[in-house]
């Protein structure tokens, strides 16, 4: 009976070409980096690079590696215990109600607003009313309402005197 | 998000063979496995077949292993099953699904879709 070896524990070298490494389950449950066989007899690893599994299962199948889209940049590659991180290029933010695909961060606050928080990989800028301090709702405002420096160039937070 | 339409059913013959094909729409079906459920005429839902997300791994339930075959072309988008030596308590209305993967139980795991059906009738 093989051991429970996962394919991330193997030399980079024996990655090339991914055995399939077997061992039996516990309980009916295969560990991390793993999947169930057919039969429920084996517990199968999971392809190095391809697709992963996280927890203890008995799961048919590993789960497909996510791929990072353009726009995005990868943080950490996919392992046979770990899906791969990808995050929203600079500039750019993913928001909770659309995860699907990074927008471009606001460049700039609508008249009357100043800036308090800067673009993040999942946040926009966070403007504020000069004098109440309530937060903007987040939508994208009109060109001609974004305050500016100079025409054409977004303020900078310090040019706004508050 | 995906949507998946079955298509295939029939009126066959015992002894005879069909092809079910189910159509999925949106991007993401290559992020998917993809399986078969059947459910007959007053009884609960059957976990028959599912294929991984490559196509490179396959499930059958005892009742239609070595008859019926489960495959995909992720250039089509599409889930297919052939059944050959049908049988009458092969009847059901069959539905495709995807999810993240199935369990042996057949528990789709994660975000999982499903279609509409197709009534496969095995009668003489």
């Known amino acids: 009976e093989s051991a429970l070896i996962t394919q991330q524990d193997l030399a980079p070298q024996q990655r090339a070409a991914p055995q399939q490494k077997r061992s039996s389950p516990s309980e009916g449950l295969c560990p991390p980096g793993h999947h169930i066989s057919e039969d429920g007899r084996d517990c199968i690893s999971c392809k190095y690079g391809q697709d992963y599994s996280t927890h203890w299962n008995d799961l048919l199948f590993c789960l497909r590696c996510t791929r990072c889209d353009s726009g995005e940049v990868e943080l950490s590659p996919c392992t046979t215990t770990r899906n791969t991180v990808c995050q929203c290029e600079e500039g750019t933010f993913r928001e909770e109600d659309s995860p699907e695909m990074c927008r471009k961060c606001r460049t700039g606050c609508p008249r009357g607003m100043v800036k308090v928080g800067d673009c993040t990989p999942w946040s926009d800028i966070e403007c504020v009313h000069k004098e109440s301090g309530t937060k903007h709702s987040g939508e994208v405002p009109a060109v001609e309402e974004t305050v500016t420096s100079s025409p054409g160039t977004p303020a900078s937070p310090c040019s706004l005197s508050g | 998000e995906v949507q998946l339409l079955e298509s295939g059913g029939g009126l066959v013959q015992p002894g005879g063979s069909l092809r079910l094909s189910c159509a999925a729409s949106?991007?993401?079906?290559?992020?998917?496995?993809m399986s078969w459920f059947r459910q007959a005429p007053g009884k609960g839902l059957e976990f028959v077949s599912a294929?991984?997300?490559?196509?490179?791994?396959?499930y059958y339930a005892d009742s239609v292993k070595g008859r019926f075959t489960i495959s995909r072309d992720n250039s089509k988008n599409t889930l297919y099953l052939q059944m050959n030596s049908l049988r009458a308590e092969d009847t059901a209305v069959y539905y495709c699904?995807?999810?993240?993967?199935?369990?042996?139980?057949?528990?789709?795991?994660?975000?999982?879709?499903w279609g509409q059906g197709t009534l496969v009738t095995v009668s003489s």
């Open positions: 949106g991007r993401t079906f290559t992020n998917y496995a």
């Open positions: 294929i991984n997300w490559s196509g490179d791994s396959t």
């Open positions: 699904a995807s999810a993240e993967s199935f369990s042996r139980g057949g528990l789709p795991y994660g975000m999982n879709y």
